[in-house]
């Protein structure tokens, strides 16, 4: 499976930027931080791997976007939406959100001031 290439529309829009980047390393980085050695995630074994692998690639991808509050927030919302169904309980959802909001700081970016991570119709 490949990314959709050359999509029409405003190439500077946050949606277009979020669509072009690979957010999977960010998702795995956060899942590893909150799950540690609990279980295998996707088909990739996160139990014995260093989170720095995912973090470096994650930060590189986030760095590809215009460093605006709105675009960063949209990226964080997309990560939350992508992982929502994997989060087993309310506590895990809250942990994930906490780690997600720390992500820009870990990558030395400005964190969005206000970013609503309640996605998927309130499920998360």
């Amino acid at each position: 499976m490949r990314r959709e290439r050359g999509r029409q529309g405003d190439s500077s829009s946050c949606e277009r930027q979020v669509d072009r980047v690979n957010l999977k390393p960010c998702e795995q980085h956060i899942m590893q931080r909150i799950m540690g050695e609990q279980e295998q995630y996707d088909s990739y074994d996160i139990r014995s791997t260093r989170s720095s692998d995912q973090q470096q690639r994650c930060c590189d991808e986030l760095n590809e976007m215009e460093n605006t509050q709105r675009c960063m927030c949209e990226a964080l919302q997309q990560i939350m939406e992508n992982q929502c169904d994997r989060l087993q309980d309310r506590q895990m959802v809250q942990q994930f959100k906490r780690e997600l909001m720390n992500l820009p700081q870990q990558c030395n970016f400005r964190a969005p001031q206000r970013c609503d991570l309640d996605v998927s119709g309130g499920r998360c």
Partner: antibody
């Protein structure tokens, strides 16, 4: 047809400079990270440098840091490698490679490679 | 820097046999960032496996990848004449994106 074509190789004396180019065609160049990988005669592959789509993130192998500079021009569909202070051990075939990722699971990989351009550093 | 050590250096087998190539990392590598390439003399490398176990487009199912952490394996179930080449593993999660030194698969 998706293609990468390297050029700019040649014979250069130790301490000299060369600029390699890689012309991309058949795909949206600005959508991909790009890499340079080299292979010394009879040796294995050595990753040299990478540059992200917007040029915001650049990495180098320790062996070339401070001497080589990777750059790209998305408007010209071109990747470059400026090589300064060349040494005998820089003699190699230099490959330009496109990096993609699997959108469903995330892994990265170099899926398209050029045929390479030969750099010989010798006095 | 993550050092990848491939073994054996050379593997001599006959067509039809099973080949098992090893790639060991000096530090743990996420499966997500482990790739295998094939290279034949005078040619550019060719992508075989990414994400440690996913076959690239057009790669026959006799090729399979497995492993996690520091130990990864490329297996060719039944060797075809065109499979004799040099195989490289690479990690691309943490810069510098290192390659193993390669395993040469030769006809016995």
């Amino acid at each position: 047809e998706v293609q990468l074509v390297e050029s700019g190789g040649g014979l250069v004396q130790p301490g000299g400079s060369l600029r390699l180019s890689c012309a991309a065609s058949g795909f949206i160049f600005s959508d991909y990270n790009m890499n340079w990988v080299r292979q010394a005669p009879g040796k294995g592959l050595e990753w040299v440098s990478s540059i992200t789509r917007s040029s915001r993130t650049i990495y180098y192998a320790d062996s070339v840091k401070g001497r080589f500079t990777i750059s790209r021009d998305n408007a010209k569909n071109s990747l470059y490698l400026q090589m300064n202070s060349l040494r005998d051990e820089d003699t190699a075939v230099y490959y330009c490679a496109r990096e993609d990722f699997d959108v469903s699971t995330g892994p990265y990989y170099m899926d398209v490679w050029g045929k390479g351009t030969t750099v010989t550093v010798s006095s | 820097e993550i050092v990848l050590t491939q073994s054996p250096g050379t593997l001599s087998l006959s067509p039809g046999e099973r080949a098992t190539l090893s790639c060991r990392a000096s530090q743990s590598v996420s499966n997500m960032f482990l790739v295998w390439y094939q290279q034949k003399p005078g040619q550019a490398p060719r992508l075989l496996i990414y994400g440690a176990s996913t076959r690239a487009t057009g790669i026959p199912d006799r090729f399979s990848g497995s492993g996690s952490g520091t130990d990864f394996t490329l297996t060719i179930s039944r060797l075809e004449p065109e499979d004799f080449a040099v195989y490289y593993c690479q990690q691309n999660g943490n810069s510098p994106y290192t390659f193993g030194q390669g395993t040469k698969l030769e006809i016995k």
